[in-house]
Amino acid sequence: LSVQQGPNLLQVRQGSQATLVCQVDQATAWERLRVKWTKDGAILCQPYITNGSLSLGVCGPQGRLSWQAPSHLTLQLDPVSLNHSGAYVCWAAVEIPELEEAEGNITRLFVDPDDPTQNRNRIASFPG
């Protein structure tokens, strides 16, 4: 089981939208996959994916989850608030027949205040 996550760094303006993507690859077929997003070490949500369907569509404040078979999990934050700033990690686990866990690399999300005098460039950096 492996998890690839992106982007590494995401900088967005307050009130806009942020999208975090996670790709889950498993060598053998699974009946039920448990996925999880954490922010700063605390769990935001941890639904199951069964038959290509998510058991939950929400994930933390203003967070929406989607699953695109066979392997893409997306967390969309909309609208983004200053409180969304932090370190996000995507996890995946297969619990049957034996536990197998994997985690992605951190996505650091920076949220700029909605202040027109601060005209910073948006940054989105994906791994390799």
Partner: antibody, heavy 118, light 107 residues
């Protein structure tokens, strides 16, 4: 501070049912699994099952299927375990416990003593 | 189901001693082994997860080791507050199972 506060001791008659509650505080209730564990006097611990309050999904130890029913109320941040068709074998201390970031129980309730006696 | 065996059900030691509590699984559990402490008043706390990772707030005198089917919990310098019963738990395979416990007492 994370806390799991369980309901008080129960003395019930054989053949009846009981509901044990576990009120969570200090964290987002819908984000973490709540597990239930049985401890008979002077014995080890037995895992009963878990509920994920976020979507209501459950997973039971086969041994407790048909005996235990796990539910959760998001509005009150409370998990419940109903035990039915009670016998003396069900007399035990029952714990609720939160599963942490990974596969371990990082916070436990204080336990609820159930006595089944006629 | 995987059976977890703690062969020593009770153990006596002196304050300051190094104490080792063992746990054996009926099959390989690939380090998915946790340790819990239950105080005489019934309070249960997580000590160690994934064989050797110390849970936050747990004193560093506690440590864990092992692999395959054999695991151990070591208390390097026994203190009065360590008097409790210790349980191992495997989470490699459902249903998750616990050992029978090792009760630690003061000599």
């Amino acid at each position: 501070e994370v806390q799991l506060q369980q309901s008080g001791p129960e003395l019930v008659k054989p053949g009846t049912l009981v509901n044990i509650s576990c009120k969570a505080s200090g964290y987002t209730f819908t984000s973490y699994d709540i597990n239930w564990v049985k401890q008979r006097p002077g014995q080890g611990l037995e895992w009963i099952g878990w509920i994920y309050p976020g979507d209501g999904s459950t997973n039971y130890n086969e041994k407790f299927k048909g005996k235990a029913t796990l539910t959760a109320d998001k509005s009150s941040s409370t998990a419940y375990m109903q035990l039915s068709s009670l016998t003396s074998e069900n007399s035990a201390v029952y714990f609720c416990a939160r599963r942490g970031l990974r596969y371990y129980f990082d916070y436990w309730g204080q336990g609820t003593t159930l006595t089944v006696s006629s | 189901d995987i059976q977890m065996t703690q062969t020593t059900s009770s153990l006596s030691a002196s304050l300051g001693d190094r104490v080792t509590i063992s746990c054996r699984a009926s099959q390989d559990i690939r380090n998915y082994l946790n340790w819990y402490q239950q105080k005489p008043d019934g309070t249960v706390k997580l000590l160690i997860y994934y064989t050797s990772r110390l849970h936050s707030g747990v004193p560093s005198r506690f440590s864990g080791s092992g692999s395959g089917t054999d695991y151990s919990l070591t208390i390097s310098n026994l203190e009065q507050e360590d008097i409790a019963t210790y349980f191992c738990q495997q989470v490699n395979t459902l249903p998750w199972t616990f050992g029978g416990g090792t009760k630690l007492e003061i000599k």
